[in-house]
């Protein structure tokens, strides 16, 4: 009877279960009933980082200097290359696929601290009471308006990202 | 593609003026906070001033308070800083930047020296 499962680091094909690659190493051909599983080491710039049956290596990530990016960890044929940015530069997600000099806060965010020569912007949310409708990287959070010292009424409540909208009281009518 | 030209730049005594200008291309000025951030020889970039998309807000590093003024012509897309009491320390490459400050998004820079 053929296997409908196999072990780990194995996987069905043709009704028989053959042996994955190995991390470094792309999928040749297929096992026969005769054969093992042939697999090639990647090449130079090039890797796989899983029990594999991949027919083509991965190219290894290209820290672009004109983005701002250097090599943090030269990739092997096991594992991707590392990038980071300039000395006084901050990669702009996890991945760090682009430099910024610094982080702006986004809107319902305040800038709690101005970036330096050392140290990235640091945002804090907007607490009850204040605002943010913009990216900054030098803008408070600012208070909503104070309708009633304009005599007016608040229309609609304010948000950590939007101003309270004020209006006329209503007067009643004699 | 985002163009960022400054000018402006040059040789004055201590005490002087001077008034930088960054001509922007390639997006929509009116809508970015714009910065103008220097680099003095041998040292690390520095934020000196900032200002909202408005023209309504401004930021000045503790250093340049009170002598510097940064000012935006949205109608020109121009960005200026105008240096007064110019001292020996403010000497340094002068670079306007736009949010979120890409790395591949800034200018050449502008030298201001001031020596006697």
């Known amino acids: 009877e053929p296997p409908t499962a196999c072990r780990e680091k194995q996987y069905l094909i043709n009704s028989q279960c053959c042996s994955l690659c190995q991390p470094g190493q792309k999928l040749v051909s297929d096992c026969t009933e005769f054969t093992e599983t042939e697999c090639l080491p990647c090449g130079e710039s090039e890797f796989l980082d899983t029990w594999n049956r991949e027919t083509h290596c991965h190219q290894h990530k290209y820290c672009d200097p004109n983005l701002g990016l250097r090599v943090q960890q030269k990739g092997t044929s096991e594992t991707d290359t590392i990038c980071t940015c300039e000395e006084g530069w901050h990669c702009t997600s996890e991945a760090c696929e682009s430099c910024v000099l610094h982080r702006s806060c986004s809107p319902g965010f305040g800038v709690k601290q101005i970036a330096t020569g050392v140290s990235d912007t640091i945002c804090e949310p907007c607490p009850v009471g204040f605002f943010s409708n913009v990216s900054s990287a030098f803008e408070k959070c600012h208070p909503w308006t104070s309708c009633e010292t304009k005599d007016l009424v608040v229309q609609q409540a304010g948000t950590n990202k939007t101003d309270v909208v004020c209006g006329p009281q209503d007067r009643l009518r004699a | 593609e985002v163009q960022l030209l400054e000018s402006g730049g040059g040789l004055v005594q201590p005490g002087g003026s001077l008034r930088l200008s960054c001509a922007a291309s390639?997006?929509?000025?009116?809508?970015?906070e714009m910065w103008w951030v220097r680099q003095a020889p041998g040292k690390g970039l520095e934020r000196v001033s900032?200002?909202?998309?408005?023209?309504?807000?401004?930021y000045y590093a503790d250093s340049v308070k009170g002598r510097f003024t940064i000012s935006r012509d949205n109608s020109k897309n121009t960005l200026y800083l105008q240096m007064n009491s110019l001292r020996a320390e403010d000497t340094a490459v002068y670079y306007c930047?736009?949010?979120?400050?890409?790395?591949?998004?800034w200018g050449q820079g502008t030298l201001v020296t001031v020596s006697s």
């Open positions: 930047a736009k949010l979120p400050f890409f790395f591949q998004e």
């Open positions: 390639g997006f929509t000025f009116r809508d970015y």
């Open positions: 900032a200002i909202n998309p408005q023209g309504t807000r401004t």
